[in-house]
């Protein structure tokens, strides 16, 4: 009931709780006095659920029978109303509609660890929507019975508080589970099991690692486990993957050696317990131990690529480049490089180590055969060292190879494919392709790059280290033995015409024709391989279409003749540039008379 | 699901009678109070006479009170609305309802779902 009720009741039969899809009759009757002040035909008495009007009588008591109320609670409430006033409240009532429980399933019990304590959980079922008690018993053996009882509206879980102890593993315990509503009951089926089958170990707790003589390969992992603890699973991994290695162990008293981890790894190790072979269950994982294996010396060898340049009749620039060993091979960290240079037939060497550093340039003799050996060292030691012959790499005409195309493919990329060198095309033992942004100053601090090809291979696909918009000098190179031979082309990933023109720094006249000399494109405006120059010109204060000169691009060169112009006119000059997507705006514009005598 | 369905509606002179009737169905008629609502032309619902759930109590809007008479049949699941003496200011379309749903002190629209067509009453010379 809600309020006090002094004015009248609100009656609610057979119950204030009842089965969905059941009939209630509600009766409101006021007390003697309690109508209105005139006679009791204008007592208007109305019966409301919640705050909808949905009956009404005029007397002294209403009669309703309700059908399909919904599950939950729904509140009932009486008021009277009375000629020129207000309602007045007379009283109401709350009907609780649910349904009986359902068995309660897959009761199942688990003690955590050997000193832990008895919990069950279960699955109730559909909700009553009703107050619904919950009985949780177990019995075990000599009588013994421990009952505990929950009364939350979703109860599922209960703890018993006590602890099964490992005295006989194999005695009998049996739960059950029984729900209790005013609708009716219902009980689990039981569940039997023993302390085996029930206690769940602890995780196993203060994981370290050793490695005996700093070696990878002499790895023992040791854990403390609770005292019954049969087996254990581990589990590692690399800190960086997603796929876990997985080793079983019986009776590992709390240690296990490691054979297969790799060097230099972070690895992330986890271990579980159990009591049983085939009884029980798992427990959680431990908590994660991150260590760093020891590093090992390096495997491997490197990837050495050089460069000669010519300095005088004497000396040559010799510049050495290789690439970082992979992590797997590297096994550490890259303490320092060691080079050493030596001359072939008088047997002289010099070793020098570099850090922070993958290329190493040195300036040598012209004469004499010289050969470098690059290697990588780290705290255990140096990977074997690449050895390599300085030769002339494009000394050997026959084996340069031919048809040399570079054609963009995709976002930063560049398709090199050629043709086999006309000398037999079996000698050739790797090619490589090398790479670097062309800079028209031949600048030899601009990155190198390369990669290395199979002999039956006639294509490379370049893509690191490749800009949109930037010209590339590619060289394919043919080895065999102490020869070489090669062919350069340019090629870009991506084009389009250049932003501006050539500026014209000077015009100078020489026998009746004109020098013209131009100042290079800065590369950023470049965007991508200059084709072609043109030269434009036409006289000055004319609207004739200009003439014009078209020369074929070549890195070094930035001046030209023309011989065209007539004595004493003067023309007005400028220059374009093409790249494969189109020309150039204009450079600038310059005035020129030719002075020489007229025919 | 529920249904209410009127008829009897028609055109009728200033004085006339008319009886109408809603047919109800898909709930448990005999226990729930009804209702006769109307709307008339451009304007809003106006409730118009409620019965109780055993027939005992009936209710009047003061615009009909002693000419118009509600009464029910729970053996036909039938409601019934007797109109005498009509004036033009009847003219509306009339609808039956749970008590519930539309009650002298307010309707609820989102239960108009529940409601029949109506059935149209013209008062006029």
């Known amino acids: 009931k809600i309020d006090a009720c002094k004015r009248g009741d609100v009656t609610v039969k057979p119950s204030h709780v009842i089965l969905l899809g059941s009939t209630v009759n509600i009766t409101c009757s006021l007390k003697p006095r309690q109508g209105c002040f005139h006679y009791s035909r204008r007592n208007k008495l109305i019966l409301y659920k919640f705050d909808r009007r949905i009956n009404f009588h005029h007397g002294h008591s209403l009669n309703s029978q309700v059908t399909g109320l919904p599950l939950g609670t729904t509140l009932f409430v009486c008021k009277l109303a009375c000629i020129n006033s207000d309602e007045i409240q007379i009283c109401g009532a709350e009907i609780f509609v649910g349904v009986a429980p359902e068995q309660p399933q897959n009761l199942s019990c688990i003690q955590k660890g050997e000193q832990g304590t008895v919990a069950c959980t279960w699955e109730r079922g559909r909700d009553t929507h009703l107050y619904t008690e919950y009985t949780l018993q177990l019995s075990g053996p000599k009588n013994l019975t421990w009952q505990k009882q929950c009364k939350d509206i979703y109860c599922d879980y209960l703890d018993f508080g006590i602890n099964l102890t490992p005295e006989s593993p194999e005695s009998n315990f049996t739960a059950k589970v029984t729900a209790v509503n005013s609708l009716g009951s219902s009980s689990s089926l039981p569940s039997t099991f023993t302390f085996l089958d029930i206690v769940r170990p602890l995780p196993p707790w203060d994981i370290r690692i050793k490695f005996q003589k700093a070696s990878v390969s002499r790895c023992t992992l040791y854990w403390r486990d609770e005292g019954l603890v049969l087996l254990n699973r581990l589990r590692y991994r690399p800190s960086n993957s997603r796929l876990w290695n997985m080793v079983n162990v019986t009776k590992a008293k709390g240690r296990h050696d490691l054979l297969d981890l790799k060097p230099f790894t972070e690895y992330e190790f986890q271990i579980s317990s159990k009591l049983h072979l085939y009884k029980g269950s798992w427990s959680d994982w431990s908590e994660s131990l991150r260590a760093q294996t020891p590093e090992e010396e390096p495997t491997g060898m490197l990837d050495v690529w050089y460069m000669k340049r010519h300095i005088d009749y004497s000396r040559q620039q010799i510049s050495l480049f290789w690439k970082n060993l992979s992590v797997s091979e590297a096994r550490g960290k890259i303490l320092h490089y060691q080079v050493t240079l030596q001359e072939l037939t008088g047997g002289k060497a010099m070793t020098q180590n570099i850090t922070g550093h993958t290329s190493w340039t040195t300036v040598i003799p012209r004469t004499g055969n010289w050969a470098v050996a690059v290697s990588a060292a780290n705290s255990k030691g140096s990977s074997l060292p690449t050895r390599i012959n300085i030769m002339n790499l494009c000394e050997a005409g026959l084996l340069a190879p031919r048809q040399v195309s570079a054609n963009s493919e995709g976002m930063d990329n560049i398709l090199v494919t050629w043709q086999p060198p006309r000398k037999d095309p079996s000698a050739v033992q790797e090619y490589v392709v090398e790479w670097r942004e062309l800079h028209p100053g031949g600048d030899t601090q601009v990155p190198l790059n390369w990669l290395r090809s199979r002999p039956y291979n006639v294509s490379a696909l370049i893509s690191e280290n490749i800009k949109s918009y930037i010209c590339y000098e590619i060289r394919v190179y043919a080895l065999s033995g102490d020869q070489g031979g090669c062919s350069s082309i340019l090629g870009n990933s991506k084009h389009k015409a250049p932003l501006s023109g050539p500026h014209i720094n000077a015009i100078t006249e020489e026998k009746g024709s004109i020098l013209i000399s131009w100042n290079s494109i800065p590369v950023q405006e470049q965007m991508g391989c200059l084709l072609h120059y043109r030269i434009y010109w036409k006289e000055r204060d004319s609207n004739s279409q200009p003439q014009l000169c078209e020369i074929p691009y070549r890195v070094s060169q930035n001046s030209h003749p023309i011989n065209s112009l007539q004595p004493r006119v003067t023309y007005v000059l400028w220059m374009t540039a093409l790249t494969a997507a189109g020309e150039s705006s204009h450079g600038n514009e310059r005035e020129f008379c030719l002075q020489g005598k007229a025919n | 699901q529920v249904q209410l369905q009127e008829s009897g509606g028609g055109l009728v002179q200033p004085g006339g009678s008319l009886r109408l009737s809603c047919k109800a169905s898909?709930?448990?008629?005999?226990?729930?109070?009804m209702s006769w609502v109307r709307q008339a032309p451009g304007k809003g619902l106006e409730w118009v006479s409620a019965?109780?759930?055993?027939?005992?109590?009936?209710d009047y809007a003061d615009s009909v009170e002693g000419r118009f008479t509600i009464s029910r049949d729970d053996a036909k699941n039938m409601l019934f609305l007797q109109m005498n003496s009509l004036k033009a200011e009847d003219t509306a379309r009339y609808y039956c309802?749970?008590?519930?749903?539309?009650?002298?002190?307010?309707?609820?629209?989102?239960?108009?779902?529940?409601w029949g067509q109506g059935t149209q009453v013209t008062v006029s010379s």
């Open positions: 309802a749970k008590y519930e749903d539309c009650s002298d002190y307010m309707c609820h629209r989102d239960r108009a779902g529940y």
């Open positions: 898909g709930f448990t008629f005999s226990t729930y109070a």
């Open positions: 019965i109780n759930s055993g027939g005992l109590s009936t």
